[in-house]
């Protein structure tokens, strides 16, 4: 049986080397010689020799300094032969325990930590933590038992401990109230780790904490009074720039300024924010009155995008907008001025007076009336007064200057100010009808057939309006009844129906025809007829020759 | 002279509400996170609530959240609890304690709410 | 049941010295150097007597002390006088939202 007692072996021994560990024994020695030997990690497999036997007193010995941290456990088996060679015992596991020294300091697992808290934190508040490792053994010693401290604060301001940190785990928190990112917007800590439970090797490393911005800074008018003018009636023009500053972080929704006027109960001005400087643009967002109103007071408040996250005064400015006088133009009143005239009227005579006002009652100014589109040169106008009268006749069945029996005049009024200003204003004539338009046959020109002739319709146009057109009455003249007839197609006599008494010879005739209206205005028309070579409708007219008896009837 | 004066306690039925004010004087109030801590008859000190010093931030015990809110007002040096819902188990000497670090210093001398029926 | 633990009652005589507990976790009083002594006279608003272990705010007598092994804080008095007798309560800071535990306090009879 072997003899082996438990064999530890510190690391990092001084020497001398070799060094006695135990004596291993087999109780087989009673018996006769036993020679000792052994094989393993450490003995015959790399690491090779660190340990060896004495052959025959079986003193284990170790030949170098171990170092736990590489190997922390050695296995061996041990074996005892008699002189013959032969195995007097069976081969015995030995293991040996590399005892821990504290030979590691601690190392952080970064040179520099990185973390984050909101300005404003309670104690408390979580920031960051670091974390430390050590290798020597934590299961039995505590050579690796880390204790945290911050070491130091950079700025110690507004507290020379604003941080802490857990001495076991490495969180490091608020500890102080007063975090203020526009006064001190990082920290940086020396933070060290230290072994033995903070007693024994340490190691540091930094902890950059950055403050993080709340909006806890209103955005403040400087200056908070502002004078500003403006041309009246005119929209989207810049009266004045408003400044502030905000000690927040630029380009955040906590800096970002926003603009409000509080006694603007018209929507007449509007603020936008200038998103590269935060200024505050104020705009006319309709034109002024002048004659209304000269001067405008307004109190304009900022806020930011997001709200404030503390209780803070929001700042206000004063801008005083002078309205500027424009020169305005005159305003015809009504802008559309209609009137009914007969298209008799006299020539020369006055149909109306229109005029304009003056917007600009602080100016004294005279009005000139000029006409400025009259297609059919139909009016003339009194420059000083605005009566409109006739300079020709009027008909109201010119249908290219007159739609819808109304003619339409553009008169303009300019005022003597500086610059001139010039207004518009529309007359509408509205010209009622006078019969002075007989019936007329369409068409005038008319084709039948030599052979079973097909009758023709002829429509009667008047271009006057009701009284003065249908029923309207068609009689055949000079002798034109011989060889046609006539009969109202419709009940309203608005077209009739010629067709020849007779078969007529191929050529042409003159039909004349008087029409009259339903007033009695008539008028004798003269229809061309043309007797074609063919059968029925007179669709392709082939004519033969003329015949050169001249007027046939 | 550092100075905190509560007031605005007295008797209430449970269910009902009743806001606390604390006084501020002798230091810079804004610089100072600011806690409501109470005590029931015979019993110890328990911490009810914390408000930052800008007013941003704010803690409450579980015992007393969703019912009390804390506020302040730097401009006029006043600490504020806004207690709801208030029950039997809330009666006690409230006090208002201002903490630079984590220790209370200064305190007020208290003021009592009784929750009874 | 409080967060930190001390004795409900200690006594001692004129002149005698006491110590008085205060047994937190590994997350309180183990962590931090942030523990702090409240003395409380009846009818009375506490009053801060050390801070940060074992700081004395000005005024208060060096007859108190403080200090701290493991997550076990200790305030002592020495020489005792009749003015000590009055309830003690200890406090520590811990991380989270409860940023500060009370001790179920310790009334302190002076013989």
């Known amino acids: 049986d072997w003899v082996i007692p438990p064999i530890s072996c510190p690391e990092n021994e001084k020497g001398p080397f070799p060094k006695n560990l135990v004596q291993i024994k087999s109780n087989k020695d009673k018996e006769g010689k036993v020679f000792y030997s052994i094989t393993g990690q450490g003995a015959d497999t790399p690491p090779v020799g660190v340990f060896i036997i004495e052959r025959e007193t079986g003193w284990l010995k170790v030949t170098e300094p171990l170092d736990r941290e590489r190997i922390a456990t050695y296995t061996l088996f041990s074996h005892a032969v008699s002189s013959n060679g032969n195995a007097v015992e069976d081969p015995m596991e030995i293991l040996i325990t590399v005892t821990d020294q504290n030979d590691n300091k601690p190392e952080f697992t970064q040179e520099v930590f990185k973390g984050s808290v909101m300005e404003g934190a309670l104690p408390g508040t979580s920031v960051m933590e670091v974390t430390a490792t050590d290798a020597d053994d934590d299961v039995n010693t505590y050579n690796a038992a880390i204790a945290y401290t911050i070491l130091s604060q950079d700025p110690e301001l507004p507290d020379k401990n604003m941080f802490t940190i857990n001495r076991n785990t490495g969180v490091i928190s608020v500890v102080t109230t007063g975090l203020d990112r526009e006064s001190f917007p990082t920290y940086t800590l020396v933070v060290q780790a230290a072994d033995l439970q903070g007693e024994g090797l340490s190691t540091t490393a930094t902890a950059v904490i950055t403050v993080t911005d709340t909006n806890d800074n209103p955005p403040i008018f400087n200056p908070t009074t502002y004078k500003g003018q403006v041309p009246e009636n005119e929209a989207n023009v810049v009266i004045t720039t408003l400044k502030v500053t905000d000690a927040d972080a630029p380009n955040t929704p906590a800096w970002e300024a926003v603009y409000t006027i509080l006694n603007d109960d018209g929507g007449q001005f509007v603020v936008t924010t200038n998103p590269v400087n935060n200024d505050g643009i104020l705009k006319t967002a309709k034109g002024l009155d002048f004659e209304a109103k000269q001067q405008y007071i307004l109190h304009v408040a900022v806020t930011n995008v997001v709200p404030f996250e503390v209780s803070l005064t929001t700042s206000t400015a004063t801008v005083t907008v002078d309205v500027l006088d424009v020169n305005e133009a005159p305003i015809f009143v009504p802008p559309e001025k209609r009137v009914e005239v007969s298209e008799d009227f006299g020539v020369g005579q006055e149909i109306t007076s229109y005029t304009a006002q003056e917007p600009d009652t602080f100016m004294e100014q005279k009005i000139t009336y000029r006409i400025w589109r009259d297609t059919a040169n139909w009016l003339e106008i009194n420059p000083d007064t605005g009566a409109i009268s006739t300079r020709a006749e009027l008909d109201r069945e010119d249908f290219e200057h007159v739609k819808n029996s109304t003619y339409t005049a553009l008169i303009i009024a300019t005022d003597n100010g500086s610059p001139v200003a010039t207004g518009t204003g529309t007359l509408l004539l509205i010209l009622s009808d006078v019969n002075d338009n007989a019936p007329i046959p369409e068409p005038r020109t008319i084709f039948f057939c030599e052979r079973n002739p097909k009758p023709q319709v002829i429509n009667i146009i008047d271009a006057d309006l009701p009284p003065n057109t249908s029923p309207f009455t068609a009689e055949l003249t000079h002798g034109a009844s011989a060889n046609w007839t006539i009969q109202y197609n419709d009940p309203t006599q608005e077209s009739i129906i010629l067709k020849p008494k007779m078969a007529l010879e191929v050529g042409d005739y003159k039909i004349n025809l008087k029409l009259m209206d339903n007033q009695n205005k008539d008028q004798v028309t003269t229809l061309e007829v043309s007797v074609c070579d063919c059968e029925g409708a007179a669709g392709v007219c082939r004519k033969a020759q003329p015949v050169e008896a001249g007027l046939q009837i | 002279e550092v100075q905190l004066l509560e007031s605005g306690g007295g008797l209430v039925q449970p269910g009902g509400s009743l806001r606390l004010s604390c006084a501020a004087s002798?230091?810079?109030?804004?610089?100072?996170?600011m806690s409501w801590v109470r005590q029931a008859p015979g019993k110890g000190l328990e911490w009810v609530s914390a408000?930052?010093?800008?007013?941003?931030?704010?803690y409450y015990a579980d015992s007393v959240k969703g019912r009390f809110a804390i506020s302040r007002d730097n401009s006029k040096n006043t600490l504020y609890l806004q207690m709801n819902s208030l029950r039997a188990e809330d009666t006690a000497v409230y006090y208002c304690?201002?903490?630079?670090?984590?220790?209370?210093?200064?305190w007020g001398q208290g003021t009592m709410v009784t929750v009874s029926s | 049941q409080s967060a930190l633990t001390q004795p409900a009652s200690v006594s001692g005589s004129p002149g005698q010295s006491i110590t008085i507990s205060c047994t937190g976790t590994?997350?309180?009083?183990?962590?931090?150097?942030?523990v702090s002594w409240y003395q409380q006279h009846p009818g009375k608003a506490p009053k801060l007597i050390l801070s940060?272990?074992?700081k004395r705010p000005s005024g208060v007598s060096n007859r108190f002390s403080g200090s701290k092994s493991g997550n076990t804080a200790s305030l002592s008095i020495s020489g005792l006088q009749a003015e000590d007798e009055a309830d003690y309560y200890c406090?520590?800071?811990?991380?989270?939202?409860?940023?500060?535990?009370f001790g179920g306090g310790t009334k302190l009879t002076v013989l």
């Open positions: 940060e272990v074992n």
């Open positions: 002798g230091f810079t109030f804004s610089s100072y996170a």
């Open positions: 590994s997350n309180d009083v183990g962590a931090y150097n942030y």
């Open positions: 304690a201002g903490s630079r670090t984590v220790q209370f210093d200064p």
């Open positions: 406090t520590s800071y811990t991380m989270g939202s409860t940023f500060m535990l």
């Open positions: 408000i930052s010093g800008s007013g941003g931030s704010t």
